[in-house]
Structures are given as C-alpha cells and as structure tokens.
C-alpha cells in the first residue's frame, strides 16, 4: 500500500530513507529544457525476490528541443552541480541492491534529472532526519518517521526532533546516540509496522553506509 | 474504497473531438499516475498516455501523441482524455486505470465513443 | 517498440484442464504482467512481476517465464475463467493481443 502523504516537515531538518522498501516508485522526472525519452518509463519501480531486490525500469532524458537524442543514466559532473542534493556516494557501492532484504537502494543519478525527486513510499518505509546546516538537534527520542497503516488509512509516525540555530550539525542513525526518553514518544506511536529486527538492521545499514544521496522532497 | 467513475457513451461525427472524463474517489488523487487504456472491438489493449495529477507531468503513447490530451482536475478529483480529429478507427471502449507501480489496480467501468458519419 | 505475441488466440477447453498461455517479447524484458477481461467488464489484473499473485486471485493462476519469454498457467480450470487473458509490459505500456478462453 502506497502512503497517502509525505513524511511529516520538520522545520529546519530535512529526511532521507536508508533503503528503500519494494513497491516504491520514483518518477522519473526531467529538469527544465528536458524531457523524457519516447516512450519512457514513467517511473522507476523497486522490485524483486526474496533475495534479491532492484530498481525495475530505467529513468532517461532527452532535450525537448532534439528529437532522438536519448541521455544515458551516467551523471555529469557539471549537470551534478543543478541537484538540489548533497553527494556523498561512493563508487564501490552497489547501487541496486539493498543489504537489507525487501529493499532497495538510492537510484544513481540519471544525466538531466530534475533538481527534487519524487518518491512514492509504501507502509512500512522508514525515513530519518536531521537538521540542515546551521541547526543543532534536539532530541526527544528517534530522529525518524514510519509509513504505518492504521484503520485502513496511512500515516507518518511524528519524528522526535527539534532543530534550534546553532552552529553545529547534527548526524544520521549511527553516527550520534539519540537521548530518547520514554515519555519522549507518544502512546499512539509505539506499535510499529517496521518490526524492531528492521528497525535494527536499517540502523545498522545506516551506520555502515557511509554513504548516500541525501534528497531535498520526497511526495 | 477506492473507485474510478467514467462519462457516459459518446457518438461523434469523423473530425470532431470527445473527451472522456474519470472521476477517482477513495484515494489520494494527487499521488496515483492515471492511465488511458482504449480497446477498439474485438481488439487487444491499446495505451493511450498517463498523467501525474500531482505536478501534471504527462506521457503519451506516439500513435496518439498530437492527438490526444490528457488533463486532471485535482480539486475535483477527475481525469480528462481529449482525442481529436475522430476517425471511425477510433469507436472503441475508452477506460482510467489507475498505476499501483506493479500493474494498474483499479479500472473505470469504459466509456464506449462511437465515431461514426 | 516493443511487440508482444501470444498464443494460443483462441483456446476451448473443459473445466479441471491446465491452460498454459504463452507471451513472446520482441525483446528482452526483466518482468511480466498478466490481466484477465471477462465479457463487457473492465480488465482486472492477476499476475504481476512475472510470477507474483496480485491479491485476492485464486492459487490456481500462476505465471512464470524470464527474458522474452513468459506463461500464464491455469491449473484446474473453471468456468468462471471463461475471459481473455492479456501480457503486459509495464516499462513500455504495451499490450499482447490477447487469449480468449472459452470453456465447452
């Protein structure tokens, strides 16, 4: 089930998912001048078995003034620059595959991807966040957010996270010890679709990946 | 629950346009790409093109593409498939079919367009 | 672009038989939809990613296959199957011909 809404806004942070879950897509969005090749994919999908798992389809663009031209997915460093992202991805790192089951990676940049990227995330996808630069985190408990499903209808988990103006930067899950406190977390929030070996292992993933696209907007 | 509620039959003369509404309740409108998907009698499937209701990016298939426009309405909920310059080709069922990303889940009930002279 | 090709066009065949239905890709593809059309009803969809049920479809329908090559499997077949079967392909929206089953 696709999650009706985007992860809660937490002013002054921003989120990005660790892997992604099966089923979500990503919409294979062009930056102005461009658009998709004939007959395009509309999106791309993660896909697969239980072993494996990957990103079906592939986004390409091509300039809406040229007819054939079609741009492969290998990004350019100059086109890099125009993502509103920060680029921290390592070229050993399997793209396609998340280490954790049912999962996927971030997606590589394709060449003339728009500047935000619009995910569609499904029950169970959990998201992290923290503070842009010049902020400093505060934290209730967990710095994240889980799509659940409850009485037939989705909803993002409220993540524990205030961002106050200091000049410090707060981490990703792994790189900081969260001070949770138990009445940090409201009641409703505590049974969780994403069982807590998940929550262990995305923990762990994020911890040891060092590295990832963080994505300015997810819808 | 989730439904896709299509326009009534249409008869239209050889060089006019139709347009064929979806009316979507039960979901978020704004988050689903929505198809158009035609079946001419006694024919396979034939996509027509897409939209994205939420920023209405839009695709379409390229034996249509200069014919057909597709349009959402986001405050009402409601898709919209222009075809023009109707050819007696074109009499066929017209459906939505809204895309889960696996495959479309949810199909409109067809909108039969009769082109004829 | 991509052409999909079924066969068989036309099957009759009587109820508890196996149907296999076959879908041939113009070119390699990683997966496969299948969607059933019963007579003056909208498509409903049965097999997705070559092999996966989609929810509330009876066990009885199964897919299978890999590159250009794919098959939609009925075991015990019922009257109620009485429709034509479609491929699809999701990457590029395009449609087999279809297979019409008829039940004597």
């Known amino acids: 089930e696709l999650c009706d809404d985007d992860p809660p806004e937490i002013p002054h942070a921003t989120f990005k998912a660790m892997a992604y879950k099966e089923g979500t897509m990503l919409n294979c969005e062009c930056k102005r001048g461009f658009r998709r090749i004939k007959s395009g994919s509309l999106y791309m999908l993660c896909t697969g078995n239980s072993s494996h798992s990957s990103w079906d389809n592939q986004c390409q663009c091509t300039s809406s003034a040229t007819r054939n031209t079609t741009k492969q997915v290998t990004p350019q460093p100059e086109e890099q620059k125009e993502r509103k992202t920060t680029e921290m991805q390592s070229p050993m790192q399997p793209v396609d595959q998340a280490s954790l089951p049912g999962h996927c990676r971030e997606p590589p940049p394709w060449e003339n991807e728009a500047t935000e990227r619009i995910y569609h995330f499904v029950v169970g996808q959990m998201v992290y966040y923290q503070c842009v630069q010049g902020y400093r985190a505060l934290h209730r408990g967990p710095a994240e957010s889980v799509c659940k499903m409850t009485h037939g209808k989705t909803r993002w988990t409220q993540p524990q996270l205030i961002c106050t103006g200091e000049m410090e930067t707060s981490q990703f899950p792994g790189e900081e010890k969260p001070q949770a406190s138990p009445e940090g977390r409201p009641e409703s929030e505590t049974s969780c679709l994403v069982t807590t070996t998940d929550f262990q292992i995305q923990t762990e993933m994020a911890a040891t990946m060092e590295t990832s696209i963080f994505t300015t907007e997810y819808q | 629950q989730v439904q896709l509620v299509q326009s009534g039959a249409e008869v239209k003369k050889p060089g006019a346009s139709v347009k064929v509404s979806c009316k979507a309740s039960g979901y978020s409108f704004t988050r689903y790409w929505m198809h158009w998907v035609r079946q001419p009698p006694g024919q396979r499937l034939e996509w027509m093109g897409a939209i994205y209701p939420g920023n209405s990016d839009t695709s379409y298939s390229q034996k249509f593409e200069g014919r057909v426009t597709i349009t959402a309405d986001t405050s009402a909920s409601t898709a919209y498939m222009e075809l023009s310059s109707l050819r007696s080709e074109d009499t066929a069922v017209y459906y939505c079919s809204r895309d889960y990303g696996y495959y479309f889940d949810f199909w409109g009930q067809g909108t039969t367009v009769t082109v004829s002279s | 672009e991509i052409v999909l090709t079924q066969s068989p066009d036309f099957q009759s065949v009587t109820p508890k038989e196996k149907v296999t239905i076959t879908c041939r890709a113009s070119s390699s593809r990683s997966y496969m939809q299948w969607y059933q059309q019963k007579p003056d009803q909208s498509p409903k969809r049965l097999i997705y990613?070559?092999?996966k049920s989609a929810s509330g479809v009876p066990s009885r329908f199964s897919g299978s296959g890999s590159g250009t090559d794919y098959t939609l499997t009925i075991n015990s077949l019922e009257a109620e199957d009485a429709a034509t079967y479609y491929c699809?392909?999701?990457?590029?929206?395009?449609f087999g011909q279809g297979t019409k089953l008829e039940i004597k």
């Open positions: 990613d070559t092999s």
């Open positions: 699809h392909q999701r990457s590029s929206y395009t």
